[in-house]
């Protein structure tokens, strides 16, 4: 009776810097009574890890055993349906989990007023689970790009678009006056990595802020 | 000395695309901020949308919505529009316009920030 029950239909990882979550898709008609049992293979050490027999949500967090992803030739993760003595066949992630996989993020945006200028100053991310020395400007060390939108609210624009090479940006606001909202996407320009765009962060901008030079 | 010279202009039924190029024979756009303008029948001239010549700032009017995409090919010094999603309210004359500088500055939303401007090409979306 050991493979009655359906297996998952999916199974894939959901990752930012040091905050690497496992997902699946629940089986078909489960009970009250089905969980769902994880384990995890680390490539060159090729034999799978339980790591929890009995999960009943649909997500598992991996980062706690996964630390040395950004150091490692990466994971996979398989899933299988437990309901009392039945269990299914194991689902497996399609892909290698490896750094290639984390989506980029930044941990916020700070913005400042100074003489008609917007100074922004992007705070990179600190997950309190990462190593000391794992930082993510050492783990990506070259190659740091962000792409910044500013939408200005009320205004005759939507949006300026501009990519970044550094942590800091200044925008010429030109006499313009209003809300501006900002947004930054990061990126690194050698790896294949996805961004996330930050949430929204926004400043005020009135006559107060220019000064008048000679 | 830049001469902008806009081609691409057309009819189009409303929800089809056109893309605009903006063809520059004199000097090279290399350091320049270059950019679309649209004035419709009756209506002021309006930003559409601009980019700095090294490519790393775009900027788009509050209308464009996604529908607008603004490129260049360095190669060709050319500037193109690609015009998606078209509204009876995008009908109007599209111009082509260069302006000094790639700073990161809305002054480039300001028709007054232009120096280069070509003569123009129609575009007509009908529902």
């Known amino acids: 009776h050991g493979t009655e029950l359906p297996s998952p239909p999916s199974v894939w990882f959901e990752a930012e810097f040091f905050h690497h979550i496992l997902h699946w898709t629940p089986i078909p008609n489960q009970s009250e009574s089905t969980c769902y049992e994880v384990a995890l293979l680390r490539y060159g050490i090729e034999s799978w890890n339980s790591i929890s027999n009995c999960s009943q949500t649909l997500s598992y967090d991996l980062t706690a055993v996964t630390l040395d992803l950004y150091h490692s030739n990466g994971y996979r993760a398989r899933v299988r349906a437990v309901d009392g003595s039945r269990h299914s066949n194991w689902t497996v992630t399609n892909t290698r989990f490896s750094v290639d996989e984390v989506t980029l993020t930044v941990g916020s945006v700070n913005l400042e007023i100074h003489n008609g200028f917007i100074l922004g100053k992007i705070q990179l991310p600190r997950p309190k689970m990462a190593p000391a020395n794992d930082t993510y400007e050492s783990i990506f060390s070259h190659f740091r790009e962000y792409e910044i939108a500013i939408r200005k609210v009320p205004g005759n624009f939507t949006f300026t678009h501009k990519k970044v090479k550094h942590e800091n940006f200044s925008l010429l606001t030109s006499g313009e006056v209003g809300e501006f909202c900002v947004q930054v996407k990061p990126s690194v320009a050698s790896r294949s990595n996805k961004g996330m765009w930050s949430k929204e962060e926004c400043i005020s901008l009135t006559r107060q802020y220019f000064t008048v030079t000679n | 000395e830049l001469q902008l010279v806009e081609s691409g202009g057309g009819l189009v039924q409303a929800g089809g695309s056109l893309r605009l190029s903006c063809a520059n024979s004199?000097?090279?756009?290399?350091?320049?901020?270059v950019g679309w303008f649209r004035q419709a029948p009756g209506k002021e001239r309006e930003f559409v949308a601009a980019?700095?010549?090294?490519?790393?700032?775009?900027y788009f009017g509050d209308f464009v919505e996604g529908r607008f995409s603004i490129s260049r090919d360095s190669a060709k010094n050319t500037l193109y529009l690609e015009m998606n999603k078209l509204k009876p309210e995008d009908t109007a004359v599209y111009y082509c316009?260069?302006?000094?500088?790639?700073?990161?500055?809305?002054?480039?939303?300001?028709?007054?920030?232009?120096?280069?401007w070509g003569k123009g090409t129609p575009v007509t979306v009908s529902s």
């Open positions: 980019i700095t010549w090294n490519g790393d700032t775009t």
């Open positions: 004199g000097r090279t756009f290399s350091s320049h901020t």
């Open positions: 316009a260069a302006a000094t500088g790639q700073v990161w500055s809305l002054q480039y939303l300001r028709e007054s920030s232009y120096a280069y």
